[in-house]
């Protein structure tokens, strides 16, 4: 039968866990990204924020995975889903928050928001 969407989300969670566990030096040289509201349109917003980090191989797979959860093309400098752009946080903190929230969605069966 149809594959539940949770399998794809599990892959994303595993990648985020991998990033947080393998972090030795400051992630992406301490680059800062816009914080996002972890609500509706979260995946597109997360991608729009992270896409502005370039040259950081550690998060390239995450950026790519997030594109499969967002219906539209996301380019650097695009902020259609980032409703509020008032706080910047380190990429490492961003990834930790994203991991925490995706785990929460996974537990409650809300795979795609």
């Amino acid at each position: 039968g149809p594959v539940p969407p949770s399998t794809a989300l599990r892959e994303l969670i595993e990648e985020l866990v991998n990033i947080t566990q393998n972090q030795k030096a400051p992630l992406c040289n301490g680059s800062m990204v816009w914080s996002i509201n972890l609500t509706a349109g979260m995946y597109c917003a997360a991608l729009e924020s992270l896409i502005n980090v370039s040259g950081c191989s550690a998060i390239e797979k995450t950026q790519r995975m997030l594109s499969g959860f967002c219906p539209h093309k996301v380019s650097a400098g695009q902020f259609s889903s980032l409703h509020v752009r008032d706080t910047k946080i380190e990429v490492a903190h961003f990834i930790t928050k994203l991991l925490s929230y995706t785990k929460q969605l996974f537990r409650h069966g809300q795979q795609f928001n």
């Epitope: 039968g1 149809p2 594959v3 539940p4 969407p5 399998t7 794809a8 599990r10 892959e11 994303l12 950026q63 790519r64 995975m65 594109s67 499969g68 959860f69 967002c70 219906p71 093309k73 380019s75 795979q111 795609f112």
Partner: antibody, heavy 123, light 107 residues
Amino acid sequence: EVQLLESGGGLVQPGGSLRLSCAASGFTFSSYAMSWVRQAPGKGLEWVSAFSGSGGSTYYADSVKGRFTISRDNSKNTLYLQMNSLRAEDTAVYYCVQDGLGPYFYNYGMDVWGQGTTVTVSS
Amino acid sequence: SYELTQPPSVSVSPGQTASITCSGDKLGDKYACWFQQKPGQSPVLVIYHDSKRPSGIPERFSGSNSGDTATLTISGTQAMDEADYYCQAWDSSTYVFGTGTKVTVLG
């Protein structure tokens, strides 16, 4: 290591049927969308069909719609392509391809390709 | 149906830059991918998301996409880059491949 191994190709008469299989290994098969892409002798690449990894949606090229059926068995890590009412123009190498994740898998990029299996439709 | 058009062939001298274009209506609104295929081999993804390189793809491969045209650029072209190149995009629930470009490295 991610691997895709196609089988089931061969010579078939016009109007005949064939079922291609693709055995996948080295990744969580059920998570990923999968596609079939073909290449006629001396010609370019042509996408045939895709099966999403989330939600079970299927997609087909107009040239095969109604004749080909894509399916997958996640317990066996295998992708299939049932080809009916075959025509001479279906003669090609058929590649199994690992696609992307999520409901919008097509935003990801076709990462891994099998070696291909040859289908020849001729009388 | 959606179409992606590429030049049939591009010739380049070793060490020079080869540019391959891919044209399609509002292609810049979509993600473009590029594949390299050598004779008798399966295609290999060299660019995804317009300009991103998968791991293992040399830095001399780069891509861009805006308006109606995506471009694959090979800087400092080497003999091993001689191959067929295909662009690809998704439109209306179908993947579309470009017509293909044969890159010949002279000499």
